[in-house]
C-alpha cells in the first residue's frame, strides 16, 4: 500500500566463509532524505522500547561519520535510491537476517535479506536438456548463485577430467533481480560421449578449485556395429563360403532390429547377427553392411566389399570410332567382366593374332583401309583365359581409288562420232553412288558411269570423270583425240605486201588453221583446172591473164576442205589502145564522126588525153571524142592516150577521112 | 602403291653382325606394321620379327630373342634389323614385309619386298 517504503534487492544472497557479498539494493522513501541508516544482523523488535536489538554491522550518523569497527561493512548507497551493501570478506555468522533500518524525517522502515554463507565453497549447478542426441548440438549450462566485486571466480568445464576444447561463455549478474555467475557451453556430443562425466569447476582467479558439479551424459543414439568377416580379406573364388558377423559395440536406447544389406539393398530372411554366404557366385560380389536400429534410428557398419574372383568372361571389343574415315585415329577397347581385373590381352584381326598387342586397348593414329575387318580379343586373368567373344566389325570409309577415265569406241574418234566413256576405279567404301564429268556439256549419261557424246566436236580435247561416294576422286583427264577434216582452209598473199601489179612475184599460200591427223595435201585449182599440190602458189612474173578467181583444197585421211574463192586481181597500165571511129574512118562532112579510146586498163583509165596528126593534144579528155559537124579540115590521124594509177598507154595512128558533101561538091 | 626394298644383305662370319634395312613406300608407310622373315633352301618362310609404326615395341621370334633388334625410323619409313651374334643357322633369303598389324604368319603379309641374302660362314 502507499504507506510503505519500496525496496528492491535479491530476497536471499549466498556465499562461503572468506568470500565477499554484493547486495545490489534500490529504495524510495516516503517523504524526504535519509537521514538515518542502521544495518542490523538478526534484527529482533523490542515492544518495550520500541526499537531493534541485534547486532549493529553498519551505522551511519547524521554527521556522516562511520565507526572504524565498520570498515568491513560498506553502505555503498546514498539517501534517496540506493541502498547498496558490500560485506568483505563475509563470514560464516554473517549467515541469517540483515536488516536495513532505514529514517527518514518524519517515518521509519526496517527492509529484511536474508544471507546464506556457507563454510565452503558451495558447487555450481549444471542443467542439461531434457534430451541428447548424437551430432545434435547442445547448450550445457553451469550456474552459480555467487557473483562479488571482490571476489573474482572462473568456472571450467571437464569432460572425463580433461578440460573441455569447445569455448565456453561465462556471464555474470549482479542487479537487484539476480545474482549469479554462469557458464553456457555449446557442444555436439557422439556417440562415444555417452556415458561419460561432465564437470563444471568452481576456480578462484588462480585457478584454485574451489567446488565442482558433476553429470554423466546420457547420449541417445543408433546402434553402433562393428563387421568382422571370414576370410578377413572378403577375397574369395566361387563355390567358396563366407561367413560375415554383426556385433553391437553401444546402443542407447537398446536396439530392436537386426537386418543384412547387399549394395544398399535389404537381404531378405537375413535376420540375425551372423550371414553364412554357401558356394558363392560372382553374382554374389558387392559391398555387405549389417543394420540394426533402435528408437533412435537405424545404424549401420562399414561396408565390407565382398570380391568373388572368377576367370575373364567372354569378351567383347568396343571400337570407338566404326565406321571410321582414311587417316583418322581408331581405338579398340577389350571389355570383359573378370576378377581380378585381366592382366593380360591377346588380340585378333580376321582371326589371326595380333603380336605384340597385350595391352586392354589398341590404338590406330592414322587408319588405312587394310585394318578393316572383324577385331577380337582374348583377356587373361590369375584364374584363366577367357574365351573370344564375336568380335567387333571395324569399316573404314574412304573416297574411291585409282579412279580412272576409259574411252569405249574403237581409235582413232573422227568429228562427229558418237562416244561412249566410262569411269572406273578399283575400290570405294561406301559404295559409289554418283559420277560426275568434266567438262560440263548437254551429254547424255545411259547408265551409272557411263558418258555418251553425240556427234563429238573436232574440239572436244580432255575428258576426266570423278566416282563419288561421301567424297569426290577425280580421274586424270584423257585426251579424245578426235580426228577431223583440216579446218578454216583460207588462200592467203604472202607478197607482194601491197597491191599485185603486172610483173610483180606472187605468192599465195593455202593456210589452214588446224588438222588431224596433222599429215595433209594441198591442191590448188583455177576455174576448175587444177594448178599445183603445194602449200604455196607462186608467180615469178604475174601477168593480167594470171587474174581470176582460186581455190585450195587441204585434205588428210579424214577428209579434204576448200577455201572460199580468193580473186586475184593484176593491176596494170592501159595496154591495146586503139581509136576507133564511128560511123566509120570516112565521115561526110556535116554529119557527125565519134572516136572513142578503146583500152584494156586495171584499174580502169582515169585520164584520155586526144592527139592530132602533129601531135598536137586536144582540149579534149573524155574517152569519146566528138567532132559535130565534123569538117574536112578535120580529116588526119589520130591517137589516143590512156592514164590510170599505173602508168600511161598509147594508141597507133587511126585516119579519119572527111569527104565533101554533095552540096559542096554541087557548089564547086 | 606399296614398295618394299631390303639391304645390307652380305656375307659374315659366325659371330658378326649385319644390319638389314628395308624402306617402304606407298601405303605400307606410316600406318600398320612391318615384318621380317627368312627362308633357308628347302625351307618355309618363318617370322623373324615385326613392329608396328604408330606404336609398340618389337615382336621377335625365340630363335633370334637377345641376338637381333628391330627399330623403326618413321621419318625415314625405313626398319632396321640389327643382328649380332650370327650362327651359320641364320643363313636364308631375308625378306620384309607389310601387314596391318605384326602377325607371325607369312600369310597374313599382304606386300613384300624382293629379298636380300644374308650368308653366316663357319
Known amino acids: 500500500d502507499s504507506s510503505k517504503w519500496v525496496f528492491e534487492h535479491p530476497e536471499t544472497l549466498y556465499a562461503w566463509e572468506g568470500a565477499c557479498v554484493w547486495i545490489p539494493c534500490t529504495y524510495r522513501a516516503l517523504d524526504g532524505d535519509l537521514e538515518s541508516f542502521i544495518l542490523f544482523h538478526n534484527p529482533e523488535y523490542n515492544k518495550n522500547t520500541s526499537k531493534f536489538d541485534g547486532t549493529r554491522l553498519y551505522e551511519s550518523t547524521k554527521d556522516g561519520k562511520v565507526p572504524s569497527e565498520q570498515k568491513r561493512v560498506q553502505f555503498l548507497g546514498d539517501k534517496n535510491k540506493n541502498c547498496t551493501l558490500s560485506i568483505h570478506p563475509v563470514h560464516l555468522n554473517d549467515s541469517g537476517q540483515l536488516g536495513l533500518r532505514m529514517e527518514s524525517k518524519t517515518e521509519k522502515w526496517m527492509e529484511r535479506i536474508h544471507l546464506n554463507v556457507s563454510e565452503r565453497p558451495f558447487p555450481p549447478h549444471i542443467q542439461l536438456p531434457p534430451e541428447i542426441q548424437e551430432s545434435q548440438e547442445v547448450t550445457l549450462t553451469c550456474l552459480l548463485n555467487f557473483s562479488c566485486y571482490g571476489y573474482p571466480i572462473q568456472l571450467q568445464w571437464l569432460l572425463e577430467g580433461v578440460p573441455m576444447r569447445q569455448a565456453a561463455v561465462t556471464s555474470t549478474s549482479l542487479t537487484i533481480k539476480s545474482v549469479f555467475t554462469r557458464s553456457e557451453l555449446k557442444f555436439s556430443p557422439q556417440w562415444s560421449h555417452h556415458g561419460k562425466i561432465v564437470t563444471c569447476q568452481l576456480q578462484d582467479a588462480d585457478g584454485k578449485f574451489l567446488s565442482n558439479d558433476t553429470v554423466q551424459l546420457n547420449v541417445k543414439h543408433t546402434p553402433k556395429l562393428e563387421i568382422k568377416v571370414t576370410p578377413s580379406d572378403a577375397i574369395v573364388r566361387e563355390g567358396d563360403s563366407v561367413t560375415m558377423t554383426c556385433e553391437v559395440s553401444s546402443s542407447n536406447p537398446e536396439y530392436t532390429t537386426v537386418s543384412w544389406l547387399k549394395d544398399g539393398t535389404s537381404l531378405k530372411k537375413q535376420n540375425t547377427f551372423t550371414l553364412n554366404l554357401r558356394e558363392v557366385t560372382k553374382d554374389q560380389s558387392g559391398k555387405y553392411c549389417c543394420q540394426v536400429s533402435n528408437d533412435v534410428g537405424p545404424g549401420r557398419s562399414e561396408e565390407v566389399f565382398l570380391q568373388v574372383q572368377y576367370a575373364p568372361e567372354p569378351s567383347t571389343v568396343q571400337i570407338l570410332h566404326s565406321p571410321a574415315v582414311e587417316g583418322s585415329q581408331v581405338e579398340f577397347l577389350c571389355m570383359s567382366l573378370a576378377n581380378p581385373l585381366p592382366t593380360n590381352y591377346t588380340w585378333y584381326h580376321n582371326g589371326k593374332e595380333m603380336q605384340g598387342r597385350t595391352e586392354e586397348k589398341v590404338h590406330i593414329p592414322k587408319i588405312l583401309p587394310w585394318h578393316a575387318g572383324t577385331y577380337s580379343c582374348v583377356a587373361e586373368n590369375i584364374l584363366g583365359t577367357g574365351q573370344r567373344g564375336p568380335g567387333a566389325e571395324l569399316d573404314v570409309q574412304y573416297p574411291p581409288k585409282k579412279v580412272t577415265t576409259v574411252i569405249q569406241n574403237p581409235m582413232p574418234i573422227r568429228e562427229g562420232d558418237t562416244v561412249t566413256l566410262s569411269c572406273n576405279y578399283n575400290s570405294s567404301n561406301p559404295s559409289v553412288t554418283r559420277y560426275e564429268w568434266k567438262p560440263h556439256g548437254a551429254w547424255e549419261e545411259p547408265s551409272l558411269g557411263v558418258l555418251k557424246i553425240q556427234n563429238v566436236g573436232w574440239d572436244n580435247t580432255t575428258i576426266a570423270c570423278a566416282a563419288c561416294n561421301s567424297w569426290c576422286s577425280w580421274a586424270s583427264p584423257v585426251a579424245l583425240n578426235v580426228q577431223y577434216a583440216p579446218r578454216d582452209v583460207r588462200v592467203r598473199k604472202i607478197k607482194p605486201l601491197s597491191e599485185i601489179h603486172s610483173g610483180n612475184s606472187v605468192s599465195l599460200q593455202c593456210d589452214f588453221s588446224s588438222s588431224h591427223p596433222k599429215e595433209v595435201q594441198f591442191f590448188w585449182e583455177k576455174n576448175g583446172r587444177l594448178l599445183g599440190k603445194e602449200s604455196q602458189l607462186n608467180f615469178d612474173s604475174i601477168s593480167p591473164e594470171d587474174a581470176g578467181s582460186y581455190s585450195c583444197w587441204v585434205n588428210n585421211s579424214i577428209g579434204q576442205t576448200a577455201s572460199k574463192a580468193w580473186t586475184l586481181e593484176v593491176l596494170y597500165a592501159p595496154r591495146r589502145l586503139r581509136v576507133s571511129m564511128s560511123p566509120g574512118d570516112q565521115v561526110m562532112e556535116g554529119k557527125s564522126a565519134t572516136l572513142t579510146c578503146e583500152s584494156d586498163a586495171n584499174p580502169p583509165v582515169s585520164h584520155y588525153t586526144w592527139f592530132d596528126w602533129n601531135n598536137q593534144s586536144l582540149p579534149y579528155h573524155s574517152q569519146k571524142l566528138r567532132l559535130e559537124p565534123v569538117k574536112v579540115q578535120h580529116s588526119g590521124a589520130y591517137w589516143c592516150q590512156g592514164t590510170n594509177s599505173v602508168g600511161k598507154g598509147r594508141s597507133p595512128l587511126s585516119t579519119l577521112t572527111v569527104y565533101y558533101s554533095p552540096e559542096t561538091i554541087g557548089r564547086r | 602403291q606399296v614398295q618394299l626394298v631390303e639391304s645390307g644383305g652380305g656375307l659374315v662370319q659366325a659371330g658378326g653382325s649385319l644390319r638389314l634395312s628395308c624402306a617402304a613406300s606407298?601405303?605400307?608407310?606410316?600406318?600398320?606394321?612391318m615384318g621380317w622373315f627368312r627362308q633357308a633352301p628347302g625351307q618355309e618362310r618363318r617370322f623373324v620379327a615385326g613392329?608396328?609404326?604408330?606404336?609398340?615395341?618389337?615382336v621377335y621370334a625365340d630363335s633370334v630373342k637377345g641376338r637381333f633388334t628391330l627399330s623403326r625410323d618413321n621419318a625415314k619409313n625405313t626398319v632396321h634389323l640389327q643382328m649380332n651374334s650370327l650362327k651359320p643357322e641364320d643363313t636364308a633369303v631375308y625378306y620384309c614385309?607389310?601387314?596391318?598389324?605384326?602377325?607371325?604368319?607369312?600369310?597374313?603379309?599382304?606386300?613384300w619386298g624382293q629379298g636380300t641374302q644374308v650368308t653366316v660362314s663357319s
Open positions: 614385309a607389310a601387314a596391318p598389324w605384326v602377325f607371325s604368319s607369312p600369310d597374313d603379309y599382304m606386300y
Open positions: 606407298g601405303r605400307a608407310s606410316g600406318s600398320g606394321a
Open positions: 613392329i608396328e609404326w604408330s606404336s609398340g615395341g618389337p
